[in-house]
Interface confidence: medium
Amino acid sequence: DTYKSEIAHRFKDLGEQYFKGLVLIAFSQHLQQCPYEEHVKLVREVTEFAKTCVADESAENCDKSIHTLFGDKLCAIPSLREHYGDLADCCEKEEPERNECFLQHKNDNPDIPKLKPDPVALCADFQEDEQKFWGKYLYEIARRHPYFYAPELLYYAIIYKDVFSECCQAADKAACLLPKIEHLREKVLTSAAKQRLKCASIQKFGERAFKAWSLARLSQRFPKADFTEISKIVTDLAKVHKECCHGDLLECADDRADLAKYICENQDTISTKLKECCDKPLLEKSHCIAEAKRDELPADLNPLEHDFVEDKEVCKNYKEAKHVFLGTFLYEYSRRHPDYSVSLLLRIAKIYEATLEDCCAKEDPPACYATVFDKFQPLVDEPKNLIKQNCELFEKLGEYGFQNALIVRYTKKVPQVSTPTLVEVARKLGLVGSRCCKRPEEERLSCAEDYLSLVLNRLCVLHEKTPVSEKVTKCCTESLVNRRPCFSALTPDETYKPKEFVEGTFTFHADLCTLPEDEKQIKKQTALVELLKHKPHATEEQLRTVLGNFAAFVQKCCAAPDHEACFAVEGPKFVIEIRGILA
């Protein structure tokens, strides 16, 4: 469809509330340091302008693209260069280069303090102005996560408001709010990581990589739907995510709503698990579809070998319609294996493709590809064994101990990576234990590998900004589906020159005593990384002793009447002790 005014079209489709929310998210994701009030002003101006275009689509500037309108708004900010430096250089470019330039300046690791929920203050804000409260939530999440899936953030904002509607009435606001906010926070962080991986796959590996990922995922989830149906959804979904990752949030949200409508209208041929999703309002409906339970497998599935090994026309199919044939293979294999991770399914499809590429050029192709399915077993065994070993380690050490084991493992593999990044990534990798190891056997593999893909993508995104390790660059860029096996296969870096011992790194203060448990752990784990960077060959026994002594030292000083005085006296002794143990 062609519209005289794109902004009027989107305003009418989305309605004022969602339109304003999405515009706020868009500006917050680009200008991550601007105060909320500045963004509200921009949103108000854009909304007023959109309304004039709705009233008269041929009014001045209404025919401009949304990129042009948004870009012009950003570039009109007087303090742009002062606060954002070279982002202002983007304003010298023309569209579409200007928008590309803005996207490249999004910061995945902005220097914004962690949000600490204060139930009393938050309830006061909520009761004073619900609309502002909703907007502030969108702003705070969007600026910290510049690739957050915008329509999904609107959904989480509704859930957030609902939590406050319920808990601000409660006698004990904190007891009601804090666990609910924490639960929502975990969901939001997972959602951010999932979307960041989708955007990375589109931006770094192309649309075809994202389509292959989606095809496998949707085939697992909707095994009753046939290939044509899945392919249509994959194509539409790729468009939605391409738009959101590209900053076209209004178009993305509009197209996502259309896709949800299509899925619900055709649920009879897609999945039996969508009924209750389709009765919900728009944002809940889209979220529910995305999270839908796997449908049961059709009873009458034929053995895969018939079509992909025994059929004499395999090479004809492969040569004459390569992408569709491989797509069909991935669809058929995925729907039969809900227990496999998406990455594993894509690795299997890659091996199948490589085998046909090789065999179809030979004298006797059927004899050559006859055993292709046997090649898949090692691909399946590798992650299964790895998960088994790591889950055993997790059971033995507990979450904190398991995180420390991963800190040691990864610091030895890639010691060049910054300490905060190593701590963040290893801590998140360590969470795979509590997330997946308790799951039933048939869910463990997909749970673990798909989660690890999210965490390793975070490492890749952070490393790309300041590359320091060729090994990390290689694992991140060579193959999306082989990232996890690539990192797993890395061995300790024997070429690394140890860091000098800096006493300041191991100087602690009284604030350590009042920190929440997770922040205390981060301090200790930061010290552990620095220790390993100084002594990469430290033994497990040495590290265990140092960590034990550190815990005793902190406990002693936090129990002392004057914390700071204790740290000042005991700290230097602790440093001497460390050096002695590691000598």
Partner: nanobody, 126 residues
């Protein structure tokens, strides 16, 4: 559900031609792999020709290559089999079959097709 209805069979002299049609309903014909099979009296059902779904890849049994042509008209949702240079050994009931699960893949194995027409008789005799 896919319903298939064949037509166009009849009596023809050796060397003559016939065009069979198969009208489909309940599914777009270009979204599903479709094929023609035949069964002569006292014999097994055998693959004659097939066409992939979503991609126009055609497949033929060796015995009909160069004589028969499979095609489809998406606007009419109909599959065709143009049969030229007919021989007495082509005498059989001709069935149209559809396999919507995976478009593209046209198998020569009859058991892999869940949907069948009722068949149309072709007799080649002088």
């Amino acid at each position: 559900e896919v319903q298939l209805l064949e037509s166009g069979g009849g009596l023809v002299q050796p060397g003559g031609s016939l065009r069979l049609s198969c009208a489909a309903s309940g599914r777009y014909i270009d979204e599903t792999a479709v094929a023609w099979f035949r069964q002569a009296p006292g014999k097994e059902r055998e693959f004659v020709a097939g066409i992939g779904g979503g991609v126009d890849i055609t497949y033929y049994a060796d015995s009909v290559k160069g004589r028969f042509t499979i095609s489809r008209d998406n606007s009419k949702n109909t599959l065709y089999l143009q049969m030229n240079s007919l021989r007495p050994e082509d005498t059989a009931v001709y069935y149209c079959a559809a396999r919507p699960g995976s478009p593209l893949i046209t198998s020569k194995v009859a058991d892999l097709y869940p949907y069948w027409g009722q068949g149309t008789l072709v007799t080649v005799s002088s």
